[in-house]
Amino acid sequence: SERCDDWGLDTMRQIQVFEDEPARIKCPLFEHFLKFNYSTAHSAGLTLIWYWTRQDRDLEEPINFRLPENRISKEKDVLWFRPTLLNDTGNYTCMLRNTTYCSKVAFPLEVVQKDSCFNSPMKLPVHKLYIEYGIQRITCPNVDGYFPSSVKPTITWYMGCYKIQNFNNVIPEGMNLSFLIALISNNGNYTCVVTYPENGRTFHLTRTLTVKVVGSPKNAVPPVIHSPNDHVVYEKEPGEELLIPCTVYFSFLMDSRNEVWWTIDGKKPDDITIDVTINESISHSRTEDETRTQILSIKKVTSEDLKRSYVCHARSAKGEVAKAAKVKQKVPAPRYTVELACGFGAT
């Protein structure tokens, strides 16, 4: 057969669906690979063909669209399962072609099982709520296109295994779940089960997401350097090891990159001809505020090194700060027999 533009296996879109539930999967060609949509392709005389490779098989085979009750069907650029079965797992390919043009892409589809508490190998999206921030909502995700707007589904929300009713600060409102004032105790997995009728059958859509309560932007501050500070002096003798920790607190900020770095005499550590090592550790609070510690160490410090300026810098989306460490050379304690005796005129 003539050549086909093969976009390979698109592992970026690892699609997971629950067993025994409807699933609608759009051909990724039109969303991510081609510069035109399905309608344009269709009106230009191009045909969309679907086929698949079962799990642990190499053989590509056509999809059987003649199953009882149209269990698998295609509508425009969407492949429908009503519902899925466990052995539908595999790599699916959609190919767009006519006599002169051909383009195809494959993607993995995994049908997963869930238990009665909605636990499964499904990768869960994480929704972050700000602590004590007023009313915030989460919405039952990925249910668009499953039923027409004339159909009014029933939606039941669960936290973990428990149906949400008469919860203190969490109120189900149809497709939305409202948190009146989010607290740490609201951390957990939330599931919406959407039930709708179609052609005399009842289908269920199960969607689980993880709620993580994080620091509020109302409380966010620029980075705070706890160390070095004005109260600690790093006093060393030449030949000793110099260790200076830079400890910085960062408020949680959505999509902020938190950074800590050292400069020596205003330069990058590698621009100074001394053997410096820097080690970093990171810890998080329950609301994802972050504390970063970078320890600057010089194994055998020289008197020259003790005259240098060591500055710790920190930056987040809230701002940038810097603090110099107080470093000085220790004055050796006088040795009595030499220094003091000399003072008394001993020879």
């Epitope: 620029p222 990159r257 950074e259 770095w261 990058k268 550590p269 590698d270 090592t277 820097i278 970093e280 990171i282 810098h313 930056r315 701002g319 940038e320 700060v321 810097a322």
Partner: antibody, heavy 118, light 113 residues
Framework: QVQLVQSGAEVKRPGASVKVSCKAS????????MHWVRQAPGQGLEWMGW????????DYAQKFQDRVTMTRDTSISTAYMELSRLRSDDTAVYYC???????????WGQGITVTVSS | DIVMTQSPDSLAVSLGERATINCKSS????????????LAWYKQKPGQPPKLLIY???TRESGVPDRFSGSGSGTDFTLTISSLQAEDVAVYYC?????????FGGGTKVEIK
């Protein structure tokens, strides 16, 4: 001395992926960000993203977000950039460059030519 | 995204004369807490990678001749070559690293008149 050495030229078909490497030597690999910058023939410089070799954290330009993956192997001081679903307009010289936080990109690799052609 | 606009596109200057390249950012790239402008200048010769000349808008990278200087603040920046030498023939780029995506200007080609 400080240097970044990149892998050899690549010729790829549209739809394929390319993974290029950048081996660092002469400095503490985990102490500097590694950027990837590309330059199409006769064009200017385009920043693709960076990786923090210490943590593995990345930040990609929106344009490449769903096609690029930057990784590193600290045991061999090497950074990698993989670009998938290649198109003919991805034909370019791809550079790696290091930076110490906000001090500019002070050391660059020699560049690697990736040609995408059917 | 911050857009960096360089002018002129090309510049022909006699040897020993001054060359001035401008760069304008679509938004402020000064960090108010450190008073530093997050702007770098690079020089690129054909077939070679770029070379860092200036960072923080005006700090010369070590080893860069002092005929190269950077100035400006906020949104308007200038690279000056005080006395053009033959080896300065190249394309010069400005780049902001205030916020990602870090963006480059379109480049200015400097030639000898």
């Amino acid at each position: 001395q400080v240097q970044l050495v990149q892998s050899g030229a690549e010729v790829k078909r549209p739809g394929a992926s390319v993974k290029v490497s950048c081996k660092a030597s002469g400095y503490t690999f985990t102490g500097y960000y590694m950027h990837w910058v590309r330059q199409a023939p006769g064009q200017g410089l385009e920043w693709m993203g960076w990786i923090n070799p210490y943590s593995g954290g990345t930040d990609y330009a929106q344009k490449f977000q769903d096609r690029v993956t930057m990784t590193r192997d600290t045991s061999i001081s090497t950074a990698y950039m993989e670009l998938s679903r290649l198109r003919s307009d991805d034909t370019a010289v791809y550079y790696c460059a290091r930076s110490y936080y906000y001090y500019g990109m002070d050391v660059w690799g020699q560049g690697i030519t990736v040609t995408v052609s059917s | 995204d911050i857009v960096m606009t360089q002018s002129p596109d090309s510049l022909a200057v006699s040897l020993g004369e001054r060359a001035t390249i401008n760069c304008k950012s679509s938004q402020n790239i000064i960090n108010s807490s450190t008073n530093k402008n997050y702007l770098a200048w690079y020089k690129q010769k054909p077939g070679q990678p770029p070379k860092l000349l200036i960072y923080w808008a005006s700090t010369r990278e070590s080893g860069v001749p002092d005929r190269f200087s950077g100035s400006g603040s906020g949104t308007d920046f200038t690279l000056t070559i005080s006395s053009l030498q033959a080896e300065d023939v190249a394309v010069y780029y400005c780049q902001q690293y205030y916020s990602t995506p870090f963006t480059f200007g379109g480049g200015t080609k400097v030639e000898i008149k």
